[in-house]
């Protein structure tokens, strides 16, 4: 019997305020941790800028499947959803109604850091159970995508700086592959 | 697919530090879980610690607690691993690995070439 | 830290099946240490065979298999091949933290 992916209806979540399911506590092991070990958050445009730009984070809460098998429990996952960029339109003749520039950039709302969920799986017909660690979405920003680039050009909004291991991370904090957010999209 | 390219080999003193690098293509770094394992001539392969993304921390393996820092220049897609205090017996060959940034974490995935230091007086 | 163990040395012969294993100085592995299994030939960087006690990839050849076999983590060659001569190295996550195993130098004669 074929397992059915389950889902509840999405729910907006203002970025950045959203909760995330805890992984659960693994072995007590914070000896070999770096003392500045984490990943700086990321903040894709300057606090000044953050009203002006819009990325909405949607959160959908499924079972996972791999092959036959299927997660013991449902997983919260995260969808980067919808357009984002200037909230200074351009009036168009009416002078009520707000539209893209034309030759502007185009804005994507995409993953921006992933984070890593111990899931174990049941699998059918008395086969062992599995243990995966699932990559999900743990925070969406804005990109810039400028028209004449080629589509995997995308652009940060707002300076990328380098990033070394300083100041520790709070969870979420980490972040994935670019195959994932079309499966999320896929799944849906 | 995700390629890791390496800096070439070092001849260092003890004492000294080195600092090796493990440049990205196919993926950008902050996509993926790096990590740093070394094999000493003739021995087996040691993990030296990586980024576990359930905690988004850097863990180094407690042995090399305080001689190994790991950074990442995103601007680059490129990642270091530099280890300080050399002694002789830190001469091996030095190998980023990277998971394939699939839906399921699959660490180690993809390795680099390889970077030999050489310590020695 | 934890110790991880395996065979120093095994031989089989071509067509043969051998099993090596990889335990766990901390106690029984299990699915939540999630056993990866490397192959490595001399001069050559190590390349993974299986993820996730048994996950096997793309360029994982179909006559080798992972399981979990008597509180151990194992690889199964079954209808070994001279090319399967090479050094296997297994290792554990201990909650973030991995360890190799010391090796196991695969004879196939």
């Known amino acids: 019997q074929g397992w059915q992916a389950f889902r509840n209806d999405a729910t907006e979540v203002i970025p950045g305020l959203g909760e995330y399911p805890e992984p659960p506590p693994e072995n007590n092991q914070t000896m070999n941790r770096a003392e500045n070990g984490g990943r700086p958050p990321h903040h894709p445009y300057d606090a000044k800028d953050v009203s002006e730009y819009s990325c909405r984070e949607l959160h959908y809460t499924r079972f996972l499947t791999d092959g036959p098998c299927r997660s013991a429990k449902p997983v919260t996952e995260l969808v980067c959803s919808g357009q984002c960029g200037p909230a200074r339109l351009l009036p168009n003749a009416i002078g009520r109604v707000k539209w893209w520039r034309p030759n502007g950039p185009d804005f994507r709302c995409i993953p921006d850091r992933y984070r890593a969920q111990r899931v174990q799986l049941l699998c059918p017909g008395g086969a062992a159970p599995r243990s995966r660690k699932v990559r999900l979405v743990a925070s969406c920003k804005c990109k810039r995508l400028t028209r004449f680039h080629n589509q995997s050009e995308l652009k940060d909004f707002g300076p990328e700086t380098a990033r070394p291991q300083k100041g520790r991370k709070p969870r979420p904090g980490a972040r994935g592959a670019k195959a994932n957010q079309a499966e999320l999209e896929n799944a849906y | 697919e995700v390629q890791l390219v390496q800096s070439g080999a070092e001849v260092k003193k003890p004492g000294a530090s080195v600092k090796v690098s493990c440049k990205v293509s196919?993926?950008?770094?902050?996509?993926?879980?790096m990590h740093w394992v070394r094999q000493a001539p003739g021995k087996g392969l040691e993990w030296m610690g990586g980024?576990?993304?359930?905690?988004?921390?850097?863990i180094y393996a407690q042995k090399f607690q305080g001689r190994v820092t790991m950074t990442e220049d995103t601007s680059t897609d490129t990642a270091y691993m530099e280890l300080s205090s050399l002694r002789s017996e830190d001469t091996a060959v030095y190998y980023c690995?990277?998971?394939?940034?699939?839906?399921?974490?699959?660490?180690?995935?993809?390795w680099g070439q390889g970077t030999l230091v050489t310590v020695s007086s | 830290q934890a110790v991880v163990t395996q065979e120093p040395s095994l031989t089989v012969s071509p067509g043969g099946t051998v099993t090596l294993t990889c335990g766990s100085s901390?106690?029984?592995?299990?699915?939540?240490?999630?056993p990866y299994w490397f192959q490595q030939k001399p001069g050559q960087a190590p390349r993974t065979l299986i993820s996730?006690?048994?996950d096997k990839h793309s360029w994982t050849p179909a006559r080798f298999s992972g399981s979990l076999l008597g509180g151990k983590a194992a690889l199964t060659l079954s209808g070994a091949q001279p090319e399967d001569e090479a050094e296997y190295y297994c290792?554990?996550?201990?909650?973030?933290?991995?360890?190799f195993g010391g090796g196991t130098k695969l004879t196939v004669l």
């Open positions: 196919g993926y950008t770094l902050t996509e993926l879980s």
């Open positions: 690995a990277t998971d394939s940034a699939g839906y399921w974490y699959k660490f180690f995935q993809h």
């Open positions: 290792l554990l996550d201990y909650g973030g933290t991995f360890v």
């Open positions: 996730d006690t048994d």
């Open positions: 901390t106690g029984a592995v299990t699915i939540d240490h999630y």
């Open positions: 980024f576990d993304p359930e905690d988004g921390e850097t």
